[in-house]
């Protein structure tokens, strides 16, 4: 974690855990107020690299639900709708953070995990090729 | 959250937060040993639909650093390098989880928060209005 | 059960024309991509041409480019593969092959082969 | 094109044993890979795809896996039946490229 000067309204951290164990409010807060998270929702169609998502669930993480892109094809799409095999469809990877419960079952302890899942598709060339 | 039974090994819970405030572990436990987090990095330049990457920097937040993508076109790019407008470039976006310290410059209390970003960008066909 | 039969080889001489034929059963047909492999006489596999589900999409090698066409009857179960300007290193085992999605990338289903000898 | 390269050519081995084939792709092909088993007479046959996707109907003790260009197929506990050549095949890139195989013979 990053140092930083603790304020005198600080929880207290005399803990022997501190700095491995902090405590966090679940109550989330979003920013995205101002955003339609809608708004992509088509793209997964509309796309010349298009995905399925594909529902992943497991009651001992948090969030318990995330969507997985699976594109649909290994080319891309061409404007007639067939494929381009001069073209990849690939997916765009992120690593995000999720709380797994720690012990597992356990309601108000958990533990953090980087997951990598697939958000979408883009469509690449296969090579690159190097200018000498 | 979702109601599980509490295993009798579990952290003690009787707290007037609780279930609003629970431990976390930072000690990351990270999941994807098995996957390469490189495979994916040159597909933004690659991309039909490329895109820069934007360091998102806010010490108050974990993770402090998040990369944002912008994509470079308003259209996709061709096979020839030129820009085809009758395409479009559009960003990914997914909603992550981080935490936010709280109260400010607490080392040990945060809160979860929900922000959007812009993973990658794809290259969709644009809707079309037609007007009757 | 999935069956590839391919059909239409034989001796032709270099310059010569021929036309394959690869009649499928067990399957549709229609919503598969399907391809022209060769084994060459020294084992080599090589690429001929893929066709995608609806025939709106092919693709060929530089080796056989404007010498092979590659079609396909939806309506009869049937692929083709027309060659022309044919040459000795054309002389090969050729398999008919059935790719597990619309278009054309890897195969899971292969015919028996027919054989090609291109020679005078 | 790329080029995919079965550096043994053939090796004989006993019954039971483990047997590595490699496969080395000249330029990265993202895990888009096949491996086929072939026999004397046969067409080939599709054992794996996406580089460690075991297909349907494939015995277990076959396996596939990755290490940057590097792609290898794993046979364990080798039975009299896996005596064949087996090719590699790339489908990142057209035109699609094979290896030019690995012939297995049992001792």
């Known amino acids: 974690g990053i140092a930083i000067p603790r304020n005198s309204g600080c929880p207290n951290s005399e803990d022997k855990n501190f700095p491995r164990t902090v405590m966090v409010n679940l109550n989330i807060h979003n920013r995205n107020t101002s955003t339609n998270p809608k708004r992509s929702s088509d793209y997964y169609n509309r796309s010349t690299s298009p995905w399925n998502l594909h529902r992943n669930e497991d009651p001992e993480r948090y969030p318990s639900v995330i969507w997985e892109a699976k594109c649909r094809h290994l080319g891309c799409v061409k404007a007639d709708g067939n494929v381009d095999y001069h073209m990849n469809s690939v997916p765009i990877q992120q690593e995000i953070l999720v709380l797994r419960r720690e012990p597992r079952h356990c309601p108000n302890s958990f533990r953090l995990e980087k997951i990598l899942v697939s958000v979408g598709c883009t469509c690449v060339t296969p090579i690159v090729h190097h200018v000498a | 959250g979702i109601a599980i039974p509490r295993n009798s090994g579990c952290p003690n819970s009787e707290d007037k937060n609780f279930p609003r405030t629970v431990m976390v572990n930072l000690n990351i436990h990270n999941r994807n040993t098995s996957t390469n987090p490189k495979r994916s990095s040159d597909y933004y330049n690659r991309s039909t639909s490329p895109w820069n990457l934007h360091r998102n920097e806010d010490p108050e937040r974990y993770p402090s650093v998040i990369w944002e993508a912008k994509c470079r076109h308003l259209g996709c790019v061709k096979a020839d390098g030129n820009v085809d407008y009758h395409m479009n470039s559009v960003p990914i976006q997914q909603e992550i989880l981080v935490l936010r310290r709280e109260p400010r410059h607490c080392p040990n209390s945060f809160r979860l928060e929900k922000i959007l970003v812009s993973v990658g960008c794809t290259c969709v066909t644009p809707i079309v209005h037609h007007v009757a | 059960e999935v069956q590839l039969v391919e059909s239409g080889g034989g001796l032709v001489q270099p310059g010569g024309s021929l036309k394959l034929s690869c009649v499928a059963s067990?399957?549709?047909?229609?919503?598969?991509?399907m391809s022209w492999v060769r084994q060459t006489p020294d084992k080599r596999l090589e690429l001929v041409a893929i066709?995608?589900?609806?025939?709106?999409?092919?693709f060929y090698p530089d080796s056989v480019k404007g010498r092979f066409t590659v079609s396909r009857d939806n309506a009869k179960n049937t692929l083709h593969l027309q060659m022309s300007s044919l040459k000795s290193e054309d002389t090969a085992m050729y398999y008919c092959?059935?790719?597990?999605?619309?278009?054309?990338?890897?195969?899971?289903?292969w015919g028996q082969g027919t054989t090609l000898t291109v020679s005078s | 094109d790329i080029q995919m390269t079965q550096s043994s050519p053939s090796f004989s081995v006993s019954l039971g044993d483990r047997v590595t084939i490699t496969c080395k792709a000249s330029e990265d092909i993202y895990d888009r890979l096949a491996w086929y088993q072939q026999k004397p007479g046969n067409a080939p046959r599709l054992l794996i795809s996406?580089?460690?996707s075991l297909e349907t109907g494939i015995p277990s003790r076959f396996s596939g896996s990755r290490s940057g260009k590097d792609y290898t197929l794993d046979i364990n506990s080798l039975q009299t039946e896996d005596a064949a050549t087996y090719y590699c095949?790339?489908?990142?890139?057209?035109?699609?490229?094979f290896g030019g195989g690995t012939k297995l013979e049992i001792k």
């Open positions: 092959a059935r790719d597990p999605r619309h278009d054309g990338y890897f195969f899971d289903y």
């Open positions: 095949q790339q489908y990142w890139s057209v035109p699609w490229t």
């Open positions: 067990g399957f549709t047909f229609s919503t598969y991509g």
């Open positions: 996406g580089a460690t």
């Open positions: 066709i995608n589900h609806n025939g709106g999409s092919t």
